[in-house]
Interface confidence: medium
């Protein structure tokens, strides 16, 4: 489908959220990685959000282009442009059967438009199943859930999160592929809005069943550190965050809804170039322990939890955190063992409705970013306890930081 | 309160021209797509043409060339210029605002429309 | 283009009694399917959208389900003003697409 004069310059329908009316954009600044060396002979990969900045050794220039990283949640490997893998992580959409393959025209015709899509798999992200996702024309797939109104801009999985405008070209496409073991989004020919003589992006982001995720880069026509991220964030990587309700101050019988960005991985926009690949393969996490013993005697670099009422296993830092408030699971745990649960009955679960989110020890990892419901200034909320930059780098992933309470 | 209100149909012969008029109120029209969605006598709705807050444009096939969408944010109105007339282009046309909001980075998502006009009768015959 | 489907064209149903209306899409739309309520005379109404979330204002008897090429709207049990005609619509892909309509007709 062709747009018409004037189309692709704008919103169009694509689908997703639900709510009635307008509800302002939630104008997000982008903050920066550092971007520092520590040393002259390693290459910092990425700002991990979760365990501080993370400079790992690298051979020399001439003998390797890999670069791997440890980001508590994922591990991930930079292939450059010289490396065989590269080639083999990337998709060939064009071969693979027409039938699993759909080129999404609203989203191909657009600006600014996502669209959401059922996953023919339960992909783990952040070691949740999640089945829908929604794609963005702007490089990047909310992993948030839409239906209640959720999709934030902390649940991302981004290969090249710009301002693309697929409307711009008839040949810009959005493209994706789901065979029952792996989702791609291939992002073709799309140009940059207001850059459009730099050329088209041709890249991909792959979500593997088992977790992994894959981003593959074909045709990057420029420098990403020179893409402006005036008009939009510019950046590579992942993040997950958790929402919580609080009680509202002005109105005692509403809830507040603060969104806690727990993790996040930012690449090194100057490593994404022509032909290069990066792969995350998923770490253990708490939520993958099915028993208390499993839970317990896990060695993963979580501490993880055991809550008899929702036989769980959990650090208290994911999406279900505030269930592990509600039901009182941070003050179950402390102290006892697995078999001083073997006589209770967890069938009988009910919120502990005099426990209070206040009550619970939410501290950060490191960083955090709040996004309060009910501001109407900017959205984002750095925590205050941290460096200027919002960044604690000197703490590693289970260092607790600052307890911070959610809400204004 | 939130109202569309349709104006400009009736009767036109095969060939010939209408232009159809859509003042909305009680919302911010400039943030909104608007469409037009047509009913023929006693059929379904059919879905003709979108025109996004930017004046992006898209039609149906069955309209694609005859009928042109626009729209004046200062004047809170949608237009629909139908020419090149036909017998099948008979029916009720609506007026529709788009069911949407923005999210994250000011992504915007669509999800029906959520607001109609009474709709006017466009006839085309000799 | 993406063609729906419903079935059945006419429904007759007592007042009290639960309908069920079927609407099928020619390919996936995922969950991007609204239902629409139209009462003669009347411009229709938006009654679910994302295939299974309300609109505002929209008694809880209306329920919708389905994703991918199969959806349902329930109306739990029918009232006097629920008699009307009922149109699902696709939003995953251009052109935006309608079902022909099932009629609910007092039995």
């Known amino acids: 489908l062709s747009p018409q004069p004037g189309a692709g310059h704008d919103e169009g329908p694509g689908s997703g959220w639900a709510a009635k009316g307008t509800v302002r954009g939630w104008n997000r600044r982008a903050r920066e990685s550092p971007g520092h060396v520590s040393e002259p002979d390693r290459t910092q990969l990425s700002q991990d959000l979760g365990g501080g900045t993370l400079a790992m050794d690298t051979l020399p220039d001439n003998r390797t282009r890999v670069v791997e990283d440890n980001h508590s949640y994922y591990v991930s490997r930079l292939y450059g442009p010289s490396e065989p893998h590269s080639r083999e992580l990337w998709v060939d959409v064009a071969e693979a059967n027409r039938s699993q393959v759909k080129i999404h025209t609203i989203l191909s015709n657009t600006h600014r438009q996502a669209s959401r899509v059922v996953l023919s798999f339960d992909f783990p992200f952040y070691g949740h199943p999640l089945r829908q996702i929604t794609i963005a024309t702007g490089g990047f797939i909310f992993m948030g859930d839409v239906i209640h109104r959720m999709l934030t801009a902390t649940q991302y999985v981004a290969p090249l999160m710009a301002n693309f405008n697929p409307g711009y070209s008839d040949n810009s496409t959005v493209v994706y592929f789901d065979n029952g073991t792996v989702f791609v989004v291939q992002w073709d020919h799309v140009y940059l809005q207001g850059w459009e003589d730099k050329g088209s992006f041709t890249f991909q982001a792959a979500l593997h069943h088992d977790g992994r995720i894959v981003f593959a880069y074909k045709e990057i026509p420029m420098s990403v550190p020179e893409i402006s991220s005036s008009q939009h964030p510019v950046k590579t990587g992942l993040s997950d965050a958790f929402m919580i309700l609080n009680p509202s101050p002005d109105v005692p019988e509403s809830r507040r809804r603060s969104i806690f960005e727990y993790h996040r991985i930012e690449l090194d926009p100057s490593k994404v170039t022509s032909m290069s690949a990066v792969e995350f393969t998923p770490l253990p996490t708490c939520l993958q322990h099915r028993s208390c013993d499993a839970c317990m005697s896990s060695d993963l670099t979580f501490n993880c939890s055991w809550c008899h009422v929702l036989q769980r296993c959990s650090s208290g830092f994911d999406r279900y955190r505030q269930e592990w408030m509600d039901y009182g699971c941070a003050q179950e745990a402390e102290g006892r063992m697995c078999e001083d649960f073997q006589d209770e009955d967890h069938d009988s679960a009910s919120p502990d409705t005099s426990f209070s989110p206040y009550d619970g020890d939410l501290t950060t990892t490191s960083s955090s970013l709040f996004i309060d419901s009910l501001t109407t200034e900017d959205d984002t909320k750095l925590n205050p306890y941290a460096g200027g930059d919002g960044l604690q780098n000197n703490l590693s992933p289970k260092t607790k930081g600052t307890p911070v309470h959610l809400g204004t | 309160e939130v109202q569309l209100l349709e104006s400009g149909g009736g009767l036109v012969q095969p060939g010939g021209s209408l232009r159809l008029s859509c003042a909305a109120s009680?919302?911010?029209?400039?943030?909104?797509?608007m469409s037009w969605v047509r009913q023929a006598p006693g059929k379904g709705l059919e879905w003709v043409s979108t025109i996004y807050r930017g004046a992006g444009t898209y039609y149906a096939d069955s309209v694609k060339g005859r009928f042109t969408i626009s729209r004046d944010n200062s004047k809170n109105t949608l237009y629909l210029q139908m020419n090149s007339l036909r017998a099948e282009d008979t029916a009720v046309y609506y007026c529709?605002?788009?069911?949407?909001?923005?999210?994250?980075?000011?992504?915007?998502?669509?999800?029906?429309?959520?607001?109609w006009g009474q709709g006017t009768l466009v006839t085309v015959s000799s | 283009e993406i063609v729906m489907t419903q079935s059945p064209a006419t429904l007759s149903v007592s007042p009290g009694e639960r309908a069920t209306l079927s609407c099928r899409a020619s390919?996936?739309?995922?969950?991007?399917l609204a239902w629409y309520q139209q009462k003669p005379g009347q411009a229709p109404r938006l009654l679910i959208y994302d295939a299974s979330t309300r609109a505002t204002g929209i008694p809880a008897r209306f329920s919708g389900s389905g994703s991918g090429t199969e959806f349902t709207l329930t109306i739990s049990s029918l009232q006097s003003e629920d008699f009307a005609v009922y149109y699902c619509q696709q939003y995953n892909d251009w052109p935006l697409t309608f079902g022909q309509g099932t009629k609910v007709e007092i039995k």
């Open positions: 529709a605002r788009d069911a949407s909001w923005y999210g994250p980075f000011s992504y915007y998502y669509y999800y029906g429309f959520d607001v």
């Open positions: 009680g919302f911010t029209f400039s943030n909104y797509a």
């Open positions: 390919q996936s739309v995922y969950t991007n």
